[in-house]
């Protein structure tokens, strides 16, 4: 006997009624007196509801189940489960026996939406840039366990220190509390997104923090206008300076370097001491120069992934900030040239010349020229592939019809370093072989 149930779990909200669909195909002349229908919990075999000897035997499951008795004769063996609870979640088996028997299991997935998060800020008074605050996002009575995400005002993920706890109440519903510990910048919006993975429902909460300003005005912070260019593997200095007033002491200084976009903390100096690097231990301040207003940051062993904007926050009585861009670069290697075919070449033959240059950054510009430096307008295909470190290998292929003889040059330009790497191949005589013997 073939018994049909839905393949996908039945999703039911806590407190609502759910229908666990089950059907069979009755033969002509079928009467309910012939039917034995049993619903049971798949794992424990606990009886949930049964219909035998032509009668509904009723619910064996807290009086919360019912059959569609008027539809049974048409093969509808579905079960109605009322006032769904978290504890109902799981697999239910529908057994149908007439002359023969069949069974199938249907999954019930229980869900409950999370409440709109409430946000609390501690401390919530007299906040300054450089202060560490704790933001708590609380959302209640959801199911199943939530996924929690923190974002800034632009929707970028916040990578501060996050601790999330979820506690089930007596009904099995979860209360979620997520705590973000973050160092304040000049101002900012902090958003918490509580996602119900079953309902794909997001509950949002947010808080905007504007730290205290001084009546005496902002601190003026200077950074270079142009991007700082640094070679991969070398050290870079992101310059930042402020003008200390007479009597200034480092105990009054809050200095924060952070990634401009994500607000990720890079390095900080607060409460009169260097709090150290929060960026893979590759940053350092010029501590002996801080008191003179030098807030520059040293970034060691620069990587491609470091490229971007860094913000320097300086807070004394009041605060000021400025962003400096780091442009990462790596020189391209001298190109290696290959020629195909490379034997028995005649004028009029079509050849493919490949120019390969390695481990540069950013992406290169590639130019082909003849022996006189005039651009070659043959068929050129250039591809650039980044390796795990983000450095590019460039391969440029020139397809050209040979003249009597000629020089073909490839120029690989690094647009940031304005550095050109040259390679060339000269093809002479006929017949000719490459490389020359």
């Amino acid at each position: 006997l073939e018994v049909q149930v839905p393949e996908d779990p039945v999703v039911a909200l806590v407190g609502t009624d759910a229908t666990l669909r089950c059907s069979f195909s009755p033969e002509p002349g079928f009467s309910l007196a012939q039917l034995n229908l049993i619903w049971q919990l798949t794992d424990t075999k606990q009886l949930v509801h049964s219909f035998t000897e032509g009668r509904d035997q009723g619910s064996a499951y807290a009086n919360r189940t019912a059959l569609f008795l008027d539809l049974l004769a048409q093969g509808n063996a579905s079960l109605r489960l009322q006032r769904v609870r978290v504890a109902d979640e799981g697999s239910f088996t529908c057994f149908v026996s007439i002359r023969d028997f069949g069974s199938a299991a249907v999954s019930l997935q229980v869900a409950a939406p999370y409440s709109k998060p409430s946000m609390t800020l501690e401390p919530n008074k007299d906040l300054r840039p450089g202060d560490t605050v704790t933001i708590t996002c609380s959302s209640y009575r959801g199911y199943p366990e939530a996924e929690v995400f923190w974002q800034d005002g632009q929707g970028a993920p916040l990578t501060g220190n996050v601790t999330t706890s979820q506690m089930a109440n007596e009904q099995g519903l979860f209360d979620v509390h997520s705590v973000l510990r973050v160092v304040l910048g000049a101002n900012g919006t902090y958003s918490c997104l509580v996602r119900n993975p079953v309902l794909q429902q997001d509950a949002h909460g947010s808080i905007t923090i504007t730290p205290q300003r001084s009546p005496t005005g902002a601190v003026e912070v200077q950074v270079p206008e142009d991007p700082v260019v640094a070679l991969v593997g070398t050290d870079a200095t992101l310059r930042c300076s402020f003008s200390p007033e007479p009597g200034f002491s480092l105990a009054q200084l809050n200095l924060i370097w952070q990634l401009t976009d994500t607000k990720q903390l890079v390095h900080s100096f607060t409460e009169g001491r260097d709090q150290g690097s929060a960026y893979a231990n590759r940053t350092a301040l010029f501590l002996d120069l801080l008191a003179q207003g030098n807030a520059s940051l040293r970034l060691q062993r620069v990587r491609v992934a470091d490229e971007g904007s860094f913000t320097c926050f300086v807070s004394i009585r009041d605060f000021g900030s400025a962003a400096v861009s780091l442009q990462v670069a790596a020189p391209y290697s001298k190109p290696s040239m290959t020629l195909e075919p490379n034997k028995d070449l005649r004028p009029g033959d079509t050849v493919t010349i490949t120019c390969s240059s390695y481990r540069g950054y950013p992406e290169a510009e590639v130019f082909w020229q003849d022996g006189q430096g005039a651009p070659l307008t043959g068929n050129v295909t250039t591809s650039q592939m980044a390796n795990e470190q983000g450095l590019f290998d460039v391969h440029s292929v020139l397809r050209v019809v040979l003249g009597a003889n000629g020089t073909y040059s490839c120029l690989v330009r690094n647009p940031v370093l304005q550095q050109d790497a040259h390679g060339s191949v000269t093809i002479t005589g006929q017949p000719m072989t490459f490389p020359p013997e």
Epitope: E122, P123, D126, T134, T216
Partner: antibody, heavy 116, light 107 residues
């Protein structure tokens, strides 16, 4: 509601040490620095130092660097101050108070008496 | 350390009177000054921070002013429950330092 609970009194002998406690409730313990303040009878207030319960980072008033040691127990939301080599000069009321720049909640204070 | 000088050391005022207490600092602390009230046998309570911001729940007859090195606490319409010692405290530098206190009594 926010509460900082301190024992009412401690009596100790000169030369001994004592560990004063401050149990916090009603807020996130790791979100606020805990400060300790000394007040001698009919005298002013002296800031001893403070501790960040999150990572146990401390700052001390130089005058108390060799006298006081601040610790926390996050699991019980309790801050402690150990005072060593006690003399009659250490007899005072010691308060715990939460905050960085403003001390918005204070404990009731522990009266420390150093006497033989 | 920043020195805090509070004056007067004590004063008596009648109910309904206006009282002013001043606090001088040894160096510029901008606006980072707080005032605390301590009643006999009790712990101090925050009244005002950032020189002029009234703490939640504090009666509006209390007000603060000043910046730099000179600050004042004003109590309009003195009430019997205002009998206490008042302390100023700088929050500009570590160590935090307090004024010597002003004992306010009812006349």
């Amino acid at each position: 509601q926010v509460q900082l609970q301190q024992p009412g009194a401690e009596l100790v002998r000169p030369g001994a040490s004592v560990k004063l406690s401050c149990k916090a409730s009603g807020y996130t313990f790791t979100a606020y620095w805990m400060n300790w303040v000394k007040q001698r009878p009919d005298q002013g207030l002296e800031w001893i130092g403070r501790i960040d319960p999150y990572d146990s980072e401390t700052r001390y008033n130089q005058n108390f660097r060799d006298k006081a040691r601040l610790t926390v127990d996050k699991s019980s939301s309790t801050a402690y101050m150990q005072l060593s080599s006690l003399t009659s000069e250490d007899s005072a009321v010691f308060y715990c108070a939460r905050g960085v720049r403003i001390f918005d909640y204070w404990g009731q204070g522990t009266t420390l008496t150093v006497s033989s | 350390d920043i020195q805090m000088t509070q004056s007067p050391a004590s004063l008596a005022a009648s109910v309904g009177e206006t009282v002013t207490i001043t606090c001088r600092t040894s160096e510029n602390i901008d606006y980072t000054l707080a005032w605390y009230q301590q009643k006999p046998g009790k712990s101090p309570q925050l009244l005002i921070y950032n020189a002029n911001t009234l703490e939640d729940g504090v009666p509006s007859r209390f007000s603060g002013s000043g910046s730099g090195t000179l600050f004042s606490l004003k109590i309009n319409n003195m009430q019997p429950e205002d009998t206490a010692t008042y302390f100023c405290k700088q929050a500009y530098d570590v160590p935090r330092t307090f004024g010597g206190g002003t004992k306010l009594e009812i006349k």
